[in-house]
């Protein structure tokens, strides 16, 4: 039994990161490997995590983490019964994926105005909450042509765009990511999509 | 092992207020966040609080906003929940709960709100 | 706040059965879902995290599915120690809430 793929993992940098990895063949990760991580410091304690399968050679690992600092670096065992299959490590603060933000709403009662609202999805004390940014994007159900991306790179959790900028009398659907420049972040995973029928006042033309 | 010890618990009356301590053991407290949580008699899990080992940030559960504090003394390997002005709806047993997501948990003290 | 809704709040089964349990988030939480155990007169102890994980030690009857707002937790082939109270807990946000409870008794 070898590793074909070493691990590579993501932090949300909150609670979880995520470890994933491939075999050389097929593999029930939970039967047959462990993933054991430790925070570098004095006195911590190892921690143990059973795989999960993602495929059938790739395994998957979600490690429980308390609140992530800048500084915490974990040591990663990959145990296949009592043989090492791989050793490495780990600095949650280099690999950030942000969480997905939530929430998700279309407001359409402003005149003329969609208002996207979403929630940040860490709270106050998390270092991300002041530095996501966002991309919002908006598509038409009818017309896969009509597919936009608004990118939000103010911190304030919202989108104002006129409503006339998009087809009147369809329904659209909106989704938002997020992502932080300062640990140069991956993209969160989509929010879930939020659906809307999009219908505004044509301007009364004179002839 | 990691231990955790709550005390402090005991009878009070409506209005009153008491001071819960946990002691840690078996592991380096100071890299760990912390929580209270309690259980009403015969009733299920209510998460009260929580304490950052990172920021020191701190948390309540909507029940107990204003009238309850959660603290912490690393340098005693404690972490305290100061309870005042007490309701009947307070009586439970509390636990503290280690994180990350409540790996480790006390035996818990039992709180007993009435006239 | 997030509202976590369990279901049943009770049940009756037989050693052997397939117990299933259900979690229902008010809001998208993702896979920040956890699931414990508590006997009576016993401090509660973690079986699930992450919504599928399983907590290392615990048996593999357990497993436990779901994203986003449904989550399932499911004991194989019930034990005889599995007699006890099943709590769902989201830590996706503060406050950070637990289900009712699923009393799980010997029929």
């Known amino acids: 039994m070898k590793v074909l793929q070493e691990p590579t993992c993501v932090s949300d940098y909150m609670s979880i990161s995520t470890c994933e990895w491939k075999m050389n063949g097929p593999t029930n990760c939970s039967r047959e490997l462990r993933l054991l991580y430790q925070l570098v410091f004095l006195l911590s304690e190892a921690h143990t995590c059973i795989p999960e399968n993602n495929g059938g050679a790739g395994c998957v690992c979600h490690l429980l983490m308390d609140d992530v600092v800048s500084a915490d670096n974990y040591t990663l065992d990959l145990w296949a019964g009592q043989q090492l299959l791989w050793k490495g490590s780990f600095k949650p603060s280099e690999h950030v994926k942000p969480r997905a933000p939530g929430n998700l709403t279309v407001h359409t009662n402003v005149s003329d105005t969609l208002l996207l609202t979403w929630s940040n999805p860490y709270p106050p004390d998390n270092y991300l909450y002041n530095h996501l940014t966002y991309a919002v994007n908006i598509w038409s159900e009818n017309d896969p042509a009509d597919f936009r991306i608004y990118n939000v790179t103010y911190l304030e959790p919202s989108l104002r765009i006129a409503a006339s900028t998009l087809k009147s009398g369809i329904s659209y659907r909106a989704r938002v990511r997020a992502w932080a420049q300062c640990y140069n972040t991956t993209w969160s995973e989509w929010s879930p999509s939020t659906k809307w029928h999009n219908s505004y006042r044509e301007p009364f033309e004179q002839h | 092992q990691v231990q955790l010890v709550e005390s402090g618990g005991g009878l009070v009356q409506p209005g009153g207020s008491l001071r819960l301590s946990c002691v840690a053991s078996?592991?380096?407290?100071?890299?760990?966040?912390m929580n209270w949580v309690r259980q009403a008699p015969g009733k299920g899990l209510e998460w009260v609080s929580y304490i950052s080992r990172a920021t020191g940030a701190v948390y309540y559960a909507d029940s107990v906003k204003g009238r309850f504090t959660i603290s912490r003394d690393n340098a005693k390997n404690s972490l305290y929940l100061q309870m005042n002005s007490l309701r009947d709806e307070d009586t439970a047993v509390y636990y503290c709960?280690?994180?990350?997501?409540?790996?480790?948990w006390g035996q818990g003290t039992l709180v007993t709100v009435s006239s | 706040d997030i509202q976590m809704t369990q279901s049943p709040s009770a049940m009756s089964a037989s050693v052997g059965d397939r117990v299933t349990i259900t979690c229902r988030a008010s809001q998208d939480i993702s896979n920040y879902l956890a699931w414990f155990q508590q006997k009576p007169g016993k401090v509660p102890t973690r079986l699930i995290y992450?919504?599928?994980s399983l907590q290392s030690g615990v048996p593999s009857r357990f497993s436990g599915s779901g994203s986003g707002t449904e989550f399932t937790l499911t004991i194989s082939s019930l034990q005889p120690e599995d007699f006890a109270t099943y709590y769902c807990l989201q830590w996706s946000s503060y406050p950070r809430t637990f289900g009712q409870g699923t009393k799980v008794e010997i029929k």
């Open positions: 078996g592991f380096t407290f100071s890299h760990s966040s």
């Open positions: 992450a919504a599928s």
């Open positions: 709960a280690r994180e990350p997501v409540f790996d480790y």
